[in-house]
Interface confidence: low
Amino acid sequence: FERTRSLQDPCSNCPAGTFCDNNRNQICSPCPPNSFSSAGGQRTCDICRQCKGVFRTRKECSSTSNAECDCTPGFHCLGAGCSMCEQDCKQGQELTKKGCKDCCFGTFNDQKRGICRPWTNCSLDGKSVLVNGTKERDVVCGPSPADLSPGASSVTPPAPAREPGHSPQ
C-alpha cells in the first residue's frame, strides 16, 4: 500500500520539516522560516506560534515542531497548550475582573489560583472547630468536646496542601 501511495502521490515522500511544493513540480521544499510541518506529506507548512506579551517561549519553533509557550512569572497557564495566561494571586485571594481581591470572611483559598471556597462546616459532620479558618486556610475540624474522653483525644489533621499546578481546573 505504501509503495502504491508513493507511486500515486509523490508528496507522500516529503518528510516532516518540508512541504510538497506544487509550484515547483511537487518537489519537497524546506519549510520557510517561522513555519513547521510536524508530519510527512504536507502540502503546506504551519505558521509557528509566537510567544509574546505575557507569554514566554518554553520551546523554540523548529522546522518539525511548533513553539511552546508558558507564562511570565506571576502568571499561570490555562487551556490546552497554554492558550491563556491568568494572573497569580496570593493565598487568601481570588482573581476578579479588577485584579486580586481578598477572600470574604468565611471563605479561603490556599493556592495562587482559583476561587475562594467556603470554610468547612464542621457541625455537618457532628464535629467542632478545633482551629479557626483564615483567608488562607480552611478550618480544622475535630471531635466535639463531649466525644473526647481523657486520654483518647484524636483530632483530624489538616489535609496536606496541594502542590501548585496540580489543582483541578
Partner: nanobody, 122 residues
Framework: QVQLVESGGGLVKPGGSLRLSCAAS????????MSWFRQAPGKGLEWVSH????????DYADSVKGRFTISRDNAKNSLYLQMNSLRAEDTAVYYC???????????????WGQGTLVTVSS
C-alpha cells in the same frame, strides 16, 4: 492570524497626555471585549480598563479612574486609551488584550500585543 499591535507610547512629563492605539486584525474585532493592561518595571501585570464589544460597558481600575479613557472604533478595528494627567507611577509597558471568546466576562485573555512603553518623567 490574530494580531494586536500597540502604538503611541513615549516619554512624557508628569501632567502630560498620551493616546495609545491598538490595531487589531485576524478576528472579528467588533465581537469581543478588549482590555488594556500595564506592567511597570519589576512589577506584575495590572488590569487598567476594559470595554465591551459595542462600547456600552466600560470599566477602569481605581488607579486610573477619571484620568484615562478607553474607546474603540469597530469600523477601524482599533482600540484606544487616552491618558491624561499622567504620573510617574503610570510608567509601564501597556498591552492591549483580546478576551477569550469561550470565557466571556472572565479574566482570561487569549491574545496579547507586544506592548508599548510609556515613560512619565520630568
Amino acid at each position: 492570524q490574530v494580531q494586536l499591535v500597540e502604538s503611541g507610547g513615549g516619554l512624557v512629563k508628569p501632567g502630560g497626555s498620551l493616546r495609545l492605539s491598538c490595531a487589531a486584525s485576524g478576528f472579528p474585532f467588533s465581537d469581543y471585549f478588549m482590555s488594556w493592561f500595564r506592567q511597570a518595571p519589576g512589577k506584575g501585570l495590572e488590569w487598567v480598563s476594559h470595554i465591551s464589544s459595542s462600547g456600552n460597558s466600560i470599566d477602569y481600575a481605581d488607579s486610573v479612574k477619571g484620568r484615562f479613557t478607553i474607546s474603540r472604533d469597530n469600523a477601524k478595528n482599533s482600540l484606544y486609551l487616552q491618558m491624561n494627567s499622567l504620573r510617574a507611577e503610570d510608567t509601564a509597558v501597556y498591552y492591549c488584550a483580546k478576551e477569550d471568546p469561550r470565557l466571556p466576562g472572565t479574566t482570561d485573555f487569549d491574545y496579547w500585543g507586544q506592548g508599548t512603553l510609556v515613560t512619565v518623567s520630568s
